[in-house]
């Protein structure tokens, strides 16, 4: 859960909030307390944001985009309090923003700050392009330009792709990573330095499995404790690659509970996702069950993929009918 | 302290044009509305404009929209009451008056002295 | 526009006296009410707002009264350097309107 927003203090009347995309912000404001109070917020020294005096709003000449956005704390005023309640900011609201106060005792003017971050939360994918195997971390909307690391065995990897794409909003960005062949974990790091906000994806190749037609495997599923937190809504997805793409077998969301089985031979034990341990089994093991198995652990601060890959054998019998 | 001081009356033809000023001091200019306040020889007051703090907001007297022009000139701390097609009616003391903040109150805290226009043929 | 109107026009009153001055508006205008003093020769000065408030340094017998349509100037005793045109002043909206005054004299 983050803060509406959160203030840094900087000399000459002049403090900073941090807000984010869509969100609610407090721009702050506060003068000694006296009748007749007059305020006046503006955007740049030019927009109009919001207007009160003689006891209420005037906003018929409030600029269109504040319309319906902005709104004091009413209640609040002959105390003191002249901040401005701020709605859905957008990356346009970032710039600075005066407040003017006037009351029977003085004049007042402070300044502050808007910056505006966006931080959608990222994805780590793995994904086969022919022969290669690929992570891609990616993140759909961020602002400002974020920080990207890679690192191969906790070692960070100087070699780092970045595909940018820029919007009005913000900037759409994919780091891939081409890990064919490799056995090595790999982590990815993307740091939004406005929000003080960091998200890491994780990718572990867990030893190839060779099981004969009919068994059960049981495949092991467990976050590191570095980034796991249990009071964190995450959610486990398991799934298996069938010709390049996957398809989901199982889901677990740790707000409701819930787990959601969509192949029948698939089984989860209640008693270890208890423990935050979600390995999986499969039951009566088929030709057809060879393949790279994915378990993805993911919450809003970080992704975990452990890839199992498991070889199904004919069994004697069935060799020996053919 | 606060001073106000008005500039620029005279006689004037009707048709003719007028400008007036107001050299304020003693507070910060800036941050304050200014109003031009009138008062015909022997009569009432009668509010004629006035200009917000920044001079972005100005507002006029049905008596003279359209007429006059007031502007301010905060690195300098002066107001201006630019008067077009004046009319007889327009003879008046003209004061410049402080708003209590902004403009937006609409009352007037300190005055000029005023300077006297008279429109006559 | 807002109508203001005074009584009386004129008032004749003497040192020591209670002095009330009433001014009308012709519409309500909450309590968005000024009372100034205008000496002769002089500019005005504010000595009431916001219907009751005084001014820093006026004195103390000055007060004001009233909300709505009607108001109140009263001078709770009448001293001699109150010789003086008295003029109520809605600000409640554009254009501001002043009442027409009323003119106190001491006997």
């Known amino acids: 859960i983050f803060p509406l927003a959160f203030f840094i203090y900087v000399p000459m009347n002049e403090q900073i909030v941090i807000g984010r995309l869509d969100e609610d912000i407090i721009l702050p404001s506060s003068f000694e307390r006296g009748s007749e109070v007059v305020i006046h917020w503006k955007y740049q020294d030019s927009y109009k944001v919001h207007s009160y005096y003689k006891g209420s709003d005037h906003l018929e000449s409030q600029d269109p985009r504040y319309a319906n956005r902005t709104s004091l704390f009413y209640n609040e005023i002959q105390n003191g309090n002249a901040s401005l309640f701020f709605r859905r900011v957008s990356l346009l609201d970032e710039g600075i923003y005066t407040c003017y106060v006037g009351t029977a005792i003085q004049v007042i003017t402070n300044k502050v700050v808007l910056k505006v971050g966006v931080f959608l939360t990222p994805v780590m994918k793995y994904e086969k392009r022919n022969t290669n195997s690929f992570l891609i971390c990616s993140v759909l909307s961020v602002y400002p330009r974020p920080i990207i690391t890679w690192k191969m065995d906790n070692t960070p990897i100087s070699e780092n792709n970045m595909e940018e794409t820029g919007s009005l909003d913000s900037f759409s960005i994919n780091s891939p990573l081409n890990i064919t062949g490799s056995n090595s974990s790999y982590e990815c790091t993307i740091e939004n330095s406005l929000l003080k906000q960091t998200w890491t994806g994780r990718w572990t190749m867990k030893d190839g499995l060779h099981k004969m037609q009919s068994e059960h495997v049981s495949l092991s599923c467990q976050p590191v404790n570095d980034y796991f937190s249990p009071n964190q809504d995450f959610k486990v997805t398991w799934s298996r690659m069938k010709s390049g793409t996957f398809s989901v077998l199982a889901y677990y969301l740790s707000s409701s509970q819930n787990t959601i089985i969509n192949e029948s031979r698939f089984s989860w034990n209640k008693e270890l996702i208890n423990q935050s341990d979600f390995s999986m089994n499969l039951m009566d093991l088929n030709l057809s069950d060879s393949g790279e198995y994915l378990c993805n652990i993911s919450s809003d601060e970080y992704t975990l993929l452990t890839i199992h890959t498991v070889h199904v054998e004919p069994s004697q019998e069935t060799a020996s009918h053919n | 302290q606060v001073q106000l001081v008005e500039s620029g009356g005279g006689v004037v033809q009707p048709g003719r044009s007028l400008r007036l000023s107001c050299a304020a001091s003693g507070f910060t200019f800036s941050d304050y509305g200014i109003h031009w306040v009138r008062q015909a020889p022997g009569k009432g007051l009668e509010w004629v404009a006035v200009i917000w703090y920044e001079g972005s907001d100005k507002y006029y007297a049905d008596s003279v929209r359209g007429r006059f022009t007031i502007s301010r000139d905060n690195s300098k701390n002066t107001l201006s009451l630019q008067m077009n097609s004046l009319r007889v009616e327009d003879t008046a003391v003209y004061y410049c008056?402080?708003?209590?903040?902004?403009?937006?109150?609409?009352?007037?805290?300190?005055w000029g002295q005023g300077t006297l226009v008279t429109v006559s043929s | 526009d807002i109508q203001m109107t005074q009584s009386p026009s004129t008032l004749s009153a003497s040192v020591g006296d209670r002095v009330t001055i009433t001014c009308r508006a012709s519409q309500s205008i909450s309590s968005w009410l000024a009372w100034y003093q205008q000496k002769p020769g002089k500019a005005p000065k504010l000595l009431i707002y916001?219907?009751?408030s005084l001014e820093s340094g006026v004195p103390s017998r000055f007060s004001g009264s009233g909300s709505g349509t009607e108001f109140t100037l009263t001078i709770s005793s009448l001293q001699p350097d109150d010789l003086a045109t008295y003029y109520c002043q809605q600000y409640n909206s554009y254009s501001y309107t002043f009442g027409q005054g009323t003119k106190l004299e001491i006997k």
């Open positions: 008056a402080r708003d209590r903040s902004s403009g937006a109150m609409g009352y007037f805290v300190y």
């Open positions: 916001k219907a009751s």
